[in-house]
């Protein structure tokens, strides 16, 4: 028989059928020209010592083969004396160590055998009611095609599936969509209605998220708030990465988990922008403000769950910062500026009252005055912080007020609100004999020490009646009692008590008359 | 090798059917070509039908195509033969047999290796 023609003779070696699961495999046949014909396939297990013998059986029933000792690919023509217009089955047996391992047959007609392509260049993937509807453009000159997909998990080995017979430009798949796991997807294809031709190669992997992105768990740390009032936020736990199935655990397209942060600031509700999102990756520096922190993750199907935190506002305070001065025309605030053209936020609310929406103002962009300072006015008739109760101030800082992570904390203080000096003025002022010549006065809280901060220091002031002479007491403003020493028996007193803040001096309390008896010896 | 068991032979008169069944015990069975042979009193064995291992490639001898029908079932290790419109002429002992390695033709009995007892079917006139 010469090399180039199917040999119509018995095979050269004895029928010993090995059984084994190792062998030819994988036989495909096609029309590689207009009279040239191609016949390749995979050997598994120790190649050497093997020879390969392409079988033929013709629709009469003869059968012949080609020798094709070590080599798993055979090109032939028309006239190799294989029917190539009638069905033929087709396989491969390899002889090696005195046993004969058989391929399956492929049954088909070699003229119409074209190699067909697999799903070239992208597929689009998408979700379609639970399942995964992948579709690609049908390559060129091959529309008419029968396809099947296989999928496996990071855990599973290939499971094959059925896309059905496909007839237009476009194809398109239906496959299961896992819950939980990432998927990867391999498609291949062959010509429509020639159950025995060839199927193409495999495509390239596609890999699938899982429908549900995983639920992120990160834990975060907020640094102290620095000088420039703003703190970092530090990621303290990386989000778990997703198992991935063995072809696409390199930088594979479409099945990567998105981690992003969205920041919420929750104080200063009246400026421009609350809400940004930025990339997990991309730690932001935060104002002392409160802020809700949500971590959401998503893939190409959209977003999955989230997890929310709370950031907290920094209380640290600023006891001297701020100055209000309080005319008949309004009230205005004085702190030391930042840089030219500062959008400040102004926002106070009622201690005590923290869960109700604090008051905000937001103020042109201002440059420092002469002396360096910011200042917010208001007249009295807009009764901002005119009730006599303590006032939480914080006021907040940017250059670009739309970008909610350059916001920064100027400073945070308490306020007493309305009439402070007379509001403040201490009540229930009380004189107890001390001793021959000396006195304790008590007095109850002022209303100013419910405001942490504000009150500076009471001064007690004692008055002699008969000559006049004052002496003044400064007390501390934790303390509500003092003693009055070096008091003259007999003389007539009055004492009053004023609560003072850094920037207003209290009213006098009502006058408190005593004396000290004159003791008779017996 | 493979053991193969047939039955389903009888006595059918001229233009009924038969249904004959192999069942294969043994060796793979997906990895033969299974065939049905005859043999009539005093001639020699004659191809009747053959199958490939896929299912999907069937042979005939030129008396009986049209009329036989050869099927197989990998998953119950069995091939079938359905005979209509049977004949007097179709009078014979039925084999099946297994063909691990095929020659240089299908309908040659020296390429089956292993053969079943036989079934008779006659059909009377």
């Known amino acids: 028989c010469r090399t180039s023609e199917c040999c119509f003779q018995d095979p050269p070696y004895s029928d010993a059928d090995s059984g084994s699961a190792s062998g030819p495999r994988d036989l495909s046949c096609y029309r590689i020209s207009s009279a040239g014909y191609e016949c390749s396939w995979q050997y598994e297990g120790p190649t050497a010592g093997v020879s390969h013998f392409l079988r033929c059986c013709l629709s009469s029933g003869r059968c012949c083969y080609f020798a094709t000792g070590s080599a798993t690919r055979l090109q032939f023509s028309d006239q190799a004396g294989v029917s190539v217009l009638h069905t033929v089955t087709l396989w491969v047996e390899s002889w090696a160590r005195n046993r004969t391992e058989k391929s399956p047959e492929v049954t088909l007609q070699l003229y119409k055998s074209v190699k067909y392509k697999p799903p070239l260049g992208d597929i689009k993937v998408s979700k379609l009611a639970g399942q995964l509807r992948m579709e690609w453009e049908t390559p060129d000159n091959q529309v008419g095609a029968e396809v099947q997909f296989r999928h496996r998990t990071p855990s599973s080995s290939w499971k094959l599936g059925d896309c059905g017979p496909q007839d237009d430009d476009t194809e398109s798949c239906l496959c299961p969509l896992e819950m939980n796991v990432a998927q990867e997807f391999q498609l291949r294809r062959r010509r429509l209605g020639s159950q025995g031709s060839s199927w193409s190669k495999w495509s390239s992997p596609v890999c699938v998220p899982p429908e549900n992105p995983p639920q992120p768990q990160v834990r975060f740390s907020v640094e102290q708030l620095g000088r420039d009032g703003r703190r970092r936020l530090t990621l303290k736990e990386q989000p778990t990465q997703l198992e991935l199935p063995e072809g696409c655990q390199g930088p594979a397209p479409g099945v990567e988990v998105t981690y992003q942060l969205q920041l919420h600031m929750l104080s200063c509700p009246c400026k421009a922008k609350a809400t940004r999102t930025l990339p997990l990756e991309k730690m932001p520096y935060l104002s002392g403000a409160a802020y809700n922190v949500a971590v959401i993750s998503s893939n190409r199907f959209g977003p999955g769950p989230n997890q929310t935190w709370h950031i907290p506002a920094d209380t640290h305070t600023e006891p001297v910062a701020l100055n209000i001065s309080v005319g008949t025309n309004g009230t205005t605030m004085y702190w030391p500026a930042r840089a030219q053209s500062t959008t400040y936020c102004i926002e106070w609310q009622p201690v005590g009252q923290e869960g109700s929406l604090a008051t905000c103002n937001l103020t042109a962009p201002q440059d420092p005055d002469p002396a360096g300072m910011a200042t917010y006015s208001w007249s009295r008739e807009s009764g901002a912080m005119g009730q006599e109760k303590c006032y939480h101030i914080t006021i907040f800082a940017s250059a670009h007020p739309k970008k909610l992570t350059l916001w920064s904390t100027v400073l945070s203080t308490y306020h007493f609100g309305g009439n402070a000096s007379a509001a403040g003025t201490p009540h229930h002022v009380s004189v107890k004999n001390h001793s021959l010549d000396s006195v304790s006065v008590d007095w109850a809280p002022s209303l100013l020490s419910t405001c942490p901060g504000v009150l500076k220091e009471y001064v007690v002031r004692c008055r002699d009646e008969d000559s006049n002479q004052v002496s003044e007491h400064p007390v501390q403003p934790t303390e509500t009692q003092v003693t009055l020493s070096d008091l003259r028996a007999g003389v007539a007193y009055t004492v009053q008590v004023r609560a003072d803040t850094a920037w207003l001096r209290g009213a006098w309390s009502q006058p408190q008359r005593f004396s000290i008896k004159v003791q008779v010896s017996d | 090798q493979v053991q193969l068991v047939e039955s389903g032979g009888g006595l059918v008169q001229a233009g009924g059917s038969l249904r004959l069944s192999c069942a294969a015990s043994g060796r793979t069975f997906s990895s033969y070509v299974m065939g049905w042979f005859r043999q009539a009193p005093g001639q020699e064995r004659e191809f009747v039908a053959a199958?490939?291992?896929?299912?999907?490639?069937?042979y005939y001898a030129d008396s009986v195509k049209g009329r036989f029908t050869i099927s197989r079932d990998n998953a119950k290790n069995t091939v079938y033969l359905q005979m209509n419109t049977l004949k007097p002429d179709d009078t014979a002992v039925y084999y099946c047999?297994?063909?691990?390695?095929?020659?240089?033709?299908?309908?040659?009995?020296?390429?089956?290796?292993?053969w079943g007892q036989g079934t008779q079917v006659t059909v009377s006139s």
């Open positions: 047999a297994a063909a691990s390695r095929v020659g240089v033709s299908i309908s040659q009995s020296s390429s089956y290796t292993s």
């Open positions: 199958i490939m291992r896929n299912g999907i490639m069937t």
